[in-house]
């Protein structure tokens, strides 16, 4: 006859492991008993359990409550056992020794491998600001046994570097993602992907990138100077900029205080019916925690009567 087992049995931490041992006998052979022992190199054999064809299962005190036979129906030639709730300390070599009648004893060894799935963590780097050089965007760490694989999934251009630390029964892997911050990266996902044989599927942790920036400011509303004449209603100036975090706006007049009746509404400066006293230099001040920008424009409120007089003069001059 011959003894069938596996070279390696792999189990995830906390789960149950089936340790196979099956005797395929020649004609009429019977299995009397099966003895299971832990047989790591350099240490004496430690008995797990004894399966007797007549007296059933006897589990050694060290494994009490943790070793069982598979449920029936069970082939009488099957000496497999179930090791409940595998822990890392269970990793090692096991031997199954089968006593048969009349062929004698057979033995086989297997290695139990206990997988410790990782619990990955992602740590964002320092605040990202446009204009910085190569900067740490995030680091991702995962510890397990065997060492997990840590990669990145993103549309963002960057560089990665990994390092690992070996512990007695596991390994920690840290991967860093570096990039040169630009405003186009704002809101883009950066995903750490952790692979491990103890995971049914890859674990993914996503970090959304925030890049601080402030665009140049500009003022809209003066595109047609001829609209800025005395008596015009609804005239307004709008300050244009964008940034992360979203900027705040402030309006001032360079050559004095804002005229009465002028309304400041965030990025917009609203004027009452225009008079010549609204002429002047207006400054839009844009700022966020990252930077500040200014844009200034000159408002020249036209007097239509003066204009028509000039036009007549010009005509008559010709």
């Amino acid at each position: 006859g011959e003894l069938e087992t596996s070279d390696v049995v792999t189990v995830v931490l906390g789960q149950d492991a089936k340790l196979p041992c099956f005797y395929r006998g020649d004609s009429g052979e019977q299995v009397g008993q099966v003895a299971w022992a832990r047989v790591d190199a350099g240490e004496g054999a430690q008995e797990l359990a004894l399966l007797h064809s007549k007296y059933g299962l006897h589990v050694s005190p060290a494994y009490e409550g943790r070793v069982e036979q598979p449920p029936p129906p069970r082939n009488p030639l099957d000496g497999s056992v179930l090791l409940r709730n595998a822990v890392q300390a269970d990793e090692g070599e096991y031997e199954c020794r089968v006593s048969t009648f009349p062929a004698g004893s057979f033995q086989a060894r297997l290695r139990l491998r206990v997988l410790v799935p990782p619990l990955p963590s992602l740590n964002p780097g320092p605040a990202l600001e446009e204009g910085q050089g190569l900067t740490l965007a995030a680091s991702c760490t995962a510890e397990g046994s065997p060492a997990p694989s840590v990669t990145w999934d993103t549309e963002v251009k960057g560089t990665t570097s990994s390092r690992s630390f070996k512990h007695s029964r596991s390994a920690a892997v840290t991967s860093e993602f570096h990039l040169v911050p630009s405003r186009s990266m704002n809101g883009q996902p950066l995903t750490c992907v952790v692979s491990h044989p103890g995971l049914l599927q890859d674990q993914r942790i996503t970090h959304i990138l925030h890049v601080s920036f402030l665009a140049e400011a500009s003022v809209r509303g003066l595109e047609d100077q001829n609209l800025w004449h005395i008596g015009r209603e609804g005239a307004m100036l709008k300050c244009l900029s964008e940034g992360q975090p979203p900027p705040s706006y402030n309006w001032t007049r360079l050559d004095g205080p804002l005229p009465s009746g002028v309304r400041v509404d965030g990025d917009t400066l609203g004027f009452p019916p225009l008079t010549t006293e609204h002429s002047g230099i207006y400054v839009c001040h844009v700022s966020n925690e990252f930077s500040s920008r200014d844009s200034q424009v000159t408002v020249d409120v036209l007097d239509p009567q003066e204009d028509s007089g000039k036009q007549v003069d010009l005509v008559s001059a010709s």
Epitope: E4, Q15, D16, K18, P20, F22, R24, G25, D26, S27, G28, Q30, P70, P71, P72, P73, N75, P76, L77, D78, L82
Partner: antibody, heavy 118, light 107 residues
Framework: QVQLKQSGPGLVQPSQSLSITCTVS????????VNWVRQPPGKGLEWLGV???????DYNAAFISRLSISKDISKSQVFFKMNSLQADDTAKYYC????????????WGQGTSVTVSS | DIQMTQSPASLSVSVGETVTITCRAS??????LAWYQQKQGKSPQLLVY???NLADGVPSRFSGSGSGTQYSLKINSLQSEDFGTYWC?????????FGGGTKLEIK
């Protein structure tokens, strides 16, 4: 080569017993167990029981009270007997050898079609 | 009883394509699972035992995988002779139940 040949009646009266013989060749019943499985017309497979190489038996818990499996090693025969048949026991009955580590059926008989009807 | 949920119940596939049939057990069956093929009017034939081991004489385009409660049978480069019904069966606790079957038809 390994073969399992079945013989048995095609028609059984309600409440009567069904007996099927599975004669094997190409292997010894002292080395391998034999399972019994049935399949109602157009339906799925249902495991009924097994007799192991050493002679011990295991039955599907739902059939334990009316099922008996035995063997005659010298004749290379396995005997299947089910009592108190009803119309819903109408099925094709198969014997199948246990293979590999004992937990698979690697060779099957041709099947015996059984109709339970008066 | 351990329930074996097999999917899909049926599928129609062209020759040369790849097919995957899955079987989910209601509890851990420790890879004690076999796959069979059955053609119309014939007895089942063993394809895979112990969840991943190919039975003798079975073409290498068949492969079994899985552990715990999730198992699958994959057929690469489907051949015309692969049509029929496929069954999974567990061997962990009484009774040893079969899945509901997957009828594979060739387009």
């Amino acid at each position: 080569q390994v073969q399992l040949k079945q013989s048995g009646p095609g028609l059984v009266q309600p409440s009567q017993s069904l007996s099927i013989t599975c004669t094997v060749s190409g292997f010894s019943l002292t080395n391998y167990g034999v399972n019994w499985v049935r399949q109602p017309p157009g339906k799925g497979l249902e495991w009924l029981g097994v007799i192991w190489s050493g002679g011990s038996t295991d039955y599907n818990a739902a059939f334990i009270s009316r099922l008996s499996i035995s063997k005659d090693i010298s004749k290379s025969q396995v005997f299947f007997k089910m009592n108190s048949l009803q119309a819903d026991d109408t099925a094709k009955y198969y014997c199948a050898r246990e293979g590999y580590d004992g937990y698979a059926m690697d060779y099957w008989g041709q099947g015996t079609s059984v109709t339970v009807s008066s | 009883d351990i329930q074996m949920t097999q999917s899909p119940a049926s599928l129609s596939v062209s020759v040369g394509e790849t097919v995957t049939i899955t079987c989910r057990a209601s509890e851990n069956i420790f890879s004690s699972l076999a796959w069979y093929q059955q053609k119309q009017g014939k007895s089942p034939q063993l394809l895979v035992y112990g969840a991943t081991n190919l039975a003798d004489g079975v073409p290498s385009r068949f492969s079994g995988s899985g552990s715990g409660t999730q198992y699958s049978l994959k057929i690469n480069s489907l051949q015309s002779e692969d049509f029929g019904t496929y069954w999974c069966q567990h061997f962990w606790g009484n009774p040893w139940t079969f899945g509901g079957g997957t009828k594979l038809e060739i387009k």
